[in-house]
């Protein structure tokens, strides 16, 4: 698995560099997670033909994966820093159950899947420090998450492959939109 941000050889070799700001740390953390997703997608795409399926075909699924919408304040039209930050944190918390599902879905990239999960937890902590309105953030219900996880794991092989692909793609898109909005803050 790749080394978490702040622990790569470049950082060790440059001890006199300015410490990263909170925004730079968040930016680097998201890019690190995106690299991890990219590696996981590679294994998924090599294993099945899900990646060839059209977006329209894949949209027909029962997964309630977090997605950015206009009302969330993360796009240029209607951009709202506080509303957007709440959406990003809420969305990441909602993704956690899906990242847990991914943990047993990879053979050669098992460590990478764990790294994505753990790095997301760290990212949530970074973002919570940045948010002023933590009361607006709703945490998913653990019981609901547990039953969702059981349901996902009980699917047949084809559906599990499809679910894995959809989670990775949706998580990537959510992170991309989040990072673009964070770069405006």
């Amino acid at each position: 698995a790749p080394v978490p941000p702040g622990e790569d050889s470049k950082d060790v070799a440059a001890p006199h560099r300015q410490p990263l700001t909170s925004s730079e740390r968040i930016d680097k953390q998201i890019r690190y997670i995106l690299d991890g997703i990219s590696a996981l997608r590679k294994e998924t795409c090599n294993k099945s033909n899900m990646c060839e399926s059209s977006k329209e075909a894949l949209a027909e699924n029962n997964l309630n994966l977090p997605k950015m919408a206009e009302k969330d304040g993360c796009f240029q039209s209607g951009f709202n820093e506080e509303t957007c930050l709440v959406k990003i944190i809420t969305g990441l918390l909602e993704f956690e159950v899906y990242l847990e599902y991914l943990q047993n879905r990879f053979e050669s990239s098992e460590e990478q899947a764990r790294a994505v999960q753990m790095s997301t937890k760290v990212l949530i902590q970074f973002l919570q420090k940045k948010a002023k309105n933590l009361d607006a953030i709703t945490t998913p219900d653990p019981t609901t998450n547990a039953s969702l996880l059981t349901k996902l794991q009980a699917q047949n092989q084809w559906l599990q492959d499809m679910t894995t692909h959809l989670i990775l793609r949706s998580f990537k898109e959510f992170l991309q939109s989040s990072l673009r909005a964070l770069r405006q803050m």
């Epitope: 890019r31 995106l34 796009f75 240029q76 990537k172 898109e173 991309q176 939109s177 990072l179 673009r180 770069r183 405006q184």
Partner: nanobody, 124 residues
Framework: EVQLVESGGGLVQPGGSLQLSCTTS????????VGWFRQGPGKEREFVAD????????WYAESVLGRFTISRDDAKNTVYLQMDSLKPEDTAVYYC?????????????????WGQGTQVTVSS
Amino acid sequence: EVQLVESGGGLVQPGGSLQLSCTTSGRRFSEYAVGWFRQGPGKEREFVADIGEQAENTWYAESVLGRFTISRDDAKNTVYLQMDSLKPEDTAVYYCAADKYGVGGNAQGYYDSWGQGTQVTVSS
């Protein structure tokens, strides 16, 4: 990194239109975010617009909002900048840049590949 080539620049009268293109032969260009920047005579290079891997995620500089439109055609490995209601102050060399993370942003440091630029002159 991807090799980027801009085209479509030229001389146009105030109020006129131009469409710039940013093309690459890179296989995975659809996964890149692409930004347009410009550098006017004696000025710093500045952000104009960008488009994410998800084409609906577009951002514009305040100075071009409502006049310029960024779009992408992944089948052609091309990103377009449609420039309408051009003003003399839009005169600049326009550069396109690519971000392998598919995110983009309004600062040059977010991009890892750059084109050579295309000249746009707005004058009567």
